[in-house]
């Protein structure tokens, strides 16, 4: 056959649906690879094909569009399926062509089967809500185009395996479910489950979601530097080991970069030549407020490095601060045997 | 560690504010609960305050107390109009903030509260 | 609000025997439970958190199973230091703040 620009196996876009459930799949092609829509396309007299590969098998092979009751169909750039089936998992490729042209890409449909409390090997999105921050809501997700607006489908929500019905707290809307005061114990998955008939048979849709209770930025603060501080001396003899923990709490903040950084006489410490390492770890609470520590080490100190100003940075989208480390050379212990000797020397 | 205090023999309908006072932790970063324990009864929990101030009550509370945090340090229960059977000793704890479910792992050693005309 | 129901109200157990507490909440509250020790003159102290997790520090004799309505708090071989009243709590009804404790068990360690 002749040429066709092949985008390959588009394993960004790792598709999962429920086995017994309906799903329309978009031609990947007009979404990520070209800058023309399938409009556009098909006035060019251009012609989207579908093909595919089972699972465990190499042979590429047509899609079956002649199903009882059009299990599988396409409509302009959409595969749809009504229902799926366990075996219809594999490779999809969608070709678009005519005499001069030809572009085509892959991508993996994994259809998977779900226990009756909606647990499934299926990726959940995460969507994260504001402790106590008033009323909050999460929307049944990628449920557009399967029906028209003129079907009012049934939507039953869930909690983990318990329909939410008669709660105080979370209150389903239709597609929408409404948290007024989301707390800790709101964390966990919640299920939609969408009914609704065409052609005189029943569809359900089902979406689960996990929904994670984090910080509120009501009250965020900037960062707060715990060590080092004004309580704590770094009092070393020359040739010992200098270690400077830097710890600070960031509060959660959607899309915040919280940074930690030390600097040793005003400079990184990459721009100076003593030997210096240092050591991160990061700990999180359950409502993704951050810790991060920072342990400077310089393995031998020296005279002129116990001079030196070791100050501790931090900086997130609430501020920045930072605090010196009290560091000072250790005064030797008088030699006391010494000195007693001298003193019962004089006597 | 957490303390609670103001405590003390008061006649019906005085009001009463009792204090939870907490160190080596910041209340802005934790939730706190109230409960109570009559002389020789079980454990009856009052009210709850979120990290964020927000608050919650038994429903048979109908108002007669009220949970405020004061400070970044303190929590107040106040009792708005005592009678006998609020005779008890009152607890404060802490929610350890570590799991995904709330755990009232810290509490204060309590402060009794004597009702009697 | 949710109720919990404790049962049985006192048990008597020889040492190394097998106590076995039930807690029933009057509406599904998931894995929202905790189990409680107390002493007399003491506060509680946690020893389970989402029905069947183990608190720092506390031995493996106790655990903790059940989820939706029905809970149970086991001892295997039970020590004389075990004899204490037992509290089941909801830790967050129906995901609100609601913190609804059982009526005790009174564990007697023979």
């Known amino acids: 056959s002749e040429r066709c620009d092949d985008w390959g196996l588009d394993t960004m876009r790792q598709i999962q649906v429920f086995e017994d459930e309906p799903a329309r799949i978009k031609c990947p092609l007009f979404e990520h690879f070209l800058k023309f829509n399938y409009s556009t396309a098909h006035s060019a007299g251009l012609t989207l094909i579908w093909y595919w590969t089972r699972q465990d098998r190499d042979l590429e092979e047509p899609i079956n569009f002649r199903l009882p009751e059009n299990r599988i169909s396409k409509e302009k750039d959409v595969l749809w399926f009504r229902p799926t089936l366990l075996n219809d998992t594999g490779n999809y490729t969608c070709m678009l062509r005519n005499t001069t042209y030809c572009s085509k890409v892959a991508f993996p449909l994994e259809v998977v089967q779900k226990d009756s409390c909606f647990n499934s090997p299926m990726k959940l999105p995460v969507h994260k809500l504001y402790i106590e921050y008033g009323i909050q809501r999460i929307t049944c997700p990628n449920v557009d185009g399967y029906f028209p607006s003129s079907v009012k489908p049934t939507i039953t929500w869930y909690m983990g395996c318990y329909k939410i019905q008669n709660f105080n707290n979370v209150i389903p809307e239709g597609m929408n479910l409404s948290f007024l005061i989301a707390l800790i114990s709101n964390n966990g998955n919640y299920t939609c489950v969408v009914t609704y008939p065409e052609n005189g048979r029943t569809f359900h849709l089902t979406r689960t979601l996990t929904v994670k209770v984090v910080g509120s930025p009501k009250n965020a603060v900037p960062p707060v530097i715990h060590s080092p501080n004004d309580h704590v001396v770094y009092e070393k003899e020359p040739g010992e080991e200098l270690l400077i923990p830097c710890t600070v709490y960031f509060s959660f903040l959607m899309d915040s970069r919280n940074e930690v950084w030390w600097t040793i006489d005003g400079k990184k410490p990459d721009d100076i030549t003593i030997d210096v390492t240092i050591n991160e770890s990061i700990s999180h609470s359950r409502t993704e407020d951050e810790t991060r520590t920072q342990i400077l080490s310089i393995k031998k100190v020296t005279s002129e490095d116990l001079k030196r100003s070791y100050v501790c940075h931090a900086r997130s989208a609430k501020g920045e601060v930072a605090k010196a480390a009290k560091v000072k050379q250790k005064v030797p212990a008088p030699r006391y045997t010494v000195e007693l000797a001298c003193g019962f020397g004089a006597t | 560690s957490l303390e609670e205090s103001g405590g003390r023999l008061v006649t019906p309908g005085t009001p009463l504010t009792l204090t939870c006072t907490v160190s080596g932790f910041s209340l802005s970063r934790c939730a706190m609960i109230w409960v109570r324990q009559a002389p020789g009864k079980g454990l009856e929990w009052i009210g709850f305050i979120g990290r964020g101030g927000s608050t919650w009550y038994a429903s048979w509370v109908n108002g007669r107390f009220t949970i405020s945090k004061t400070s970044s340090t303190t929590v107040d229960l106040k009792i708005t109009s005592p009678t006998t059977e609020d005779t008890a000793t009152y607890f404060c704890?802490?929610?350890?903030?570590?799991?995904?479910?709330?755990?009232?792992?810290?509490w204060g050693q309590g402060t009794l509260v004597t009702v009697s005309s | 609000d949710v109720v919990m129901t404790q049962t049985p109200a006192s048990v008597s157990e020889p040492v190394g025997g097998t106590v076995t507490i039930k807690c029933q909440a009057s509406q599904n509250i998931g894995s929202n439970l905790a189990w409680y020790q107390q002493k007399p003159g003491q506060p509680p102290k946690l020893l389970i958190y989402g029905a069947s997790t183990l608190a720092s520090g506390v031995p493996s004799r106790f655990s903790g199973s059940g989820s939706g309505t029905e809970f149970t708090l086991t001892i295997s071989g039970v020590q004389s230091a075990d004899a204490a009243t037992y509290y089941c709590q909801c830790s967050g009804y129906d995901t609100t703040g609601v913190f609804p404790f059982g009526g005790g068990s009174e564990v007697v360690v023979k």
């Open positions: 704890a802490r929610d350890g903030d570590y799991s995904d479910y709330y755990t009232f792992d810290l």
